[in-house]
């Protein structure tokens, strides 16, 4: 058997660190057998069999010029083997970031914090953490570890399925190369990393007869599981074309009527979502949808201009107990509390 331990990586390659002493090992001889060393394709003897170093070649303070292929020969001139030297660095702790688009699963991505220049792989696992005792603030790793399955095709991402929303997890991402391993531990709670995908299917429609109104409607992101206990709230922004500033409202459901649109101008609208109890952060904005208020047909029964009702329209209030989390159903409404005076009068 070879006297040379095989480091992780391609066969026949040995590894070292720039600026450090590097030992190359002749693979095809018995440990301690004296050998001669040459650079591949060069006749010059690098180290003779009388060096006292047996089957090893020592390179002091290796640098990039030392990288390449070496040949070792036994005393009788037989080929002891070829060795390729590759220089690089031990792993540094990777940087890890975790995110959740729903309350049942989360994914973690990682990236090296320093490029080692060597073949590298990553080991990914996680534990669920539990509180030690009812009064204790300390948490300790308790269950697991379980593998965090990595994406195929080599993407630097792994996914934890079936996570518990109220639990805390410790993610372990270990960078491994032939010179060692380095581990990043990251504590993650689903509540803090939750960021829904943006709402889908945003539509903006005019409201016939109301030249300052637009009705926007949307749906939950497809990635959000439809269970009544974990709902989303929404934030809607709108602005007329060429206006730099957005107006922001927080709709009560899956629809919103904008009542202060600028008549005749197209408006951009976008929506964002967040867990209803403010876990995590707001989603990114949905793609913008555009709509233009209707030109407005004047009602037949028009009073004299002096009798115009110019107070803001008010949606009738209904006293009902609010559930802790609202229904998934949209809350349709045409008028809302922010109604403003419109160009076309409405009968009182």
């Amino acid at each position: 058997s070879s006297p040379c331990p095989q480091a992780w990586g391609p066969p026949g390659v040995q590894y070292g660190q720039p600026g450090r002493s590097v030992k190359l090992c002749c693979p095809g001889v018995t440990a301690g057998d004296p050998v001669s060393w040459f650079r591949d394709g060069e006749p010059k003897l690098l180290q003779g069999p009388d060096s006292g170093l047996g089957h090893e070649l020592v390179l002091a303070q290796a640098d990039s010029t030392d990288e390449g292929t070496y040949i070792c020969q036994t005393l009788d001139g037989a080929l002891g083997g070829t060795v390729t030297l590759q220089l690089g660095y031990p792993p540094a702790r990777p940087v890890v970031s975790c995110q959740a688009a729903d309350y049942e699963n989360f994914s973690c991505t990682w990236s090296p914090s320093q490029i080692s220049g060597l073949p590298t792989r990553y080991l990914t696992s996680y534990r669920k953490k539990t509180v030690l005792g009812a009064d204790s603030q300390r948490r300790s790793p308790s269950t697991g570890p379980w593998p965090c399955p990595q994406d195929p095709l080599g993407a630097a991402r792994c996914v934890v399925h079936g996570a518990e929303f109220w639990s805390q997890y410790r993610i372990n991402v270990t960078e491994v190369n032939p010179l060692g391993a380095s581990t990043r531990l990251l504590d993650v709670s689903l509540q803090s990393i939750l960021r829904p995908d943006p709402p889908q299917g945003l539509r903006v429609e005019s409201v016939p007869g109301y030249p300052r109104r637009l009705r926007a409607s949307w749906t939950y992101p497809a990635s959000w599981p439809c269970q009544p206990h974990f709902l989303l709230k929404f934030r809607l922004q709108y602005r007329p074309a060429q206006h730099p500033a957005w107006s922001t409202v927080e709709p009560a459901g899956l629809e919103e009527v904008i009542t202060d649109a600028v008549a005749g101008l197209p408006h951009a609208v976008r929506v964002s979502a967040r867990d209803f109890l403010d876990a995590g952060t707001w989603s990114t904005w949905s793609p913008e949808a555009w709509g233009t208020p209707s030109t407005g047909t004047i009602p037949k029964e028009i009073p004299a201009w002096g009798q115009l009702h110019t107070q803001p329209e008010v949606e009738p209030q209904v006293d009902s107990p609010a559930p802790p989390r609202p229904s998934l159903q949209p809350h349709p409404r045409l008028l809302d509390h922010r109604d403003s005076v419109e160009q076309v009068a409405v009968l009182a």
């Epitope: 540094a92 702790r93 940087v95 890890v96 970031s97 991505t109 990682w110 990236s111 090296p112 914090s113 320093q114 490029i115 220049g117 990043r184 990251l186």
Partner: antibody, heavy 118, light 107 residues
Framework: EVQLLESGGGLVQPGGSLRLSCAAS????????MTWVRQAPGKGLEWVSS????????QYADSVKGRFTISRDNSKNTLYLQMNSLRAEDTAVYYC???????????WGRGTLVTVSS | DIQMTQSPSSLSASVGDRVTITCQAS??????LNWYQQKPGKAPKLLIY???NLQTGVPSRFSGSGSGTDFTFTISSLQPEDIATYYC?????????FGPGTKVDIK
């Protein structure tokens, strides 16, 4: 010579923007994580933001999150910090610093002064 | 975030004195602690990394020790050129934090 050289500082009004640059030389820039650290006049050091070698992961201090953006151009050996919605409390000398790894800083630039004042 | 505290905030010592600065982390940071020296008007300089490792080119009179939450930085024999502010900094977390600094001057 191994060095980092910051530029782009200056006087800006509250709410304004600045873009800092850090030119690296003498080492393989694309191998290392890079960081911005700041120091308000007469105060201590405050980590601002870091970016990994490939540029695909970044991290920010809470005090600048959503306002500052770190980026890098490995082909130009340059690190950037885009600073928007600047506040008086962002007034500081901004240093660019190099890894090893993430969170250790073995090479620093001389710094560039950013003053936010009306 | 992990909070770092340093003591004392300032000290005066004579040339040749042994100087000790302590740094405490608000939670366990293993040995992920660095020490920096900053002279007036200059950028900081890394002296000690990972609690006890001397950075290349740094004089051996500087040393560090500790792990977990409590760390110590020592100048075995204070020299005039050591007048500076010294900062500890943790990198256990992906959001590094610095201590408030200790100003060292000569009596």
């Amino acid at each position: 010579e191994v060095q980092l050289l910051e530029s782009g500082g200056g006087l800006v009004q509250p709410g304004g923007s600045l873009r800092l640059s850090c030119a690296a030389s003498g080492f393989t820039f694309s191998t290392y994580s890079m960081t911005w650290v700041r120091q308000a006049p007469g105060k201590g050091l405050e980590w601002v933001s870091s970016i990994v070698p490939y540029g695909d992961l970044t991290q920010y201090a809470d005090s600048v999150k959503g306002r500052f953006t770190i980026s890098r151009d490995n082909s130009k050996n340059t690190l950037y910090l885009q600073m928007n919605s600047l506040r008086a409390e962002d007034t500081a000398v901004y240093y660019c610093a190099k890894g090893p790894g993430w969170g250790s800083f073995d090479l620093w630039g001389r710094g560039t002064l950013v003053t936010v004042s009306s | 975030d992990i909070q770092m505290t340093q003591s004392p905030s300032s000290l005066s010592a004579s040339v040749g004195d042994r100087v000790t600065i302590t740094c405490q982390a608000s939670q366990d940071i293993n040995n992920y602690l660095n020490w920096y020296q900053q002279k007036p008007g200059k950028a900081p300089k890394l002296l000690i990394y990972d609690a006890s490792n001397l950075q290349t080119g740094v004089p051996s009179r500087f040393s560090g020790s500790g792990s977990g939450t409590d760390f110590t930085f020592t100048i075995s024999s204070l020299q005039p050129e050591d007048i500076a502010t010294y900062y500890c900094q943790q990198h256990e977390s992906q959001s590094p934090t610095f201590g408030p600094g200790t100003k060292v001057d000569i009596k």
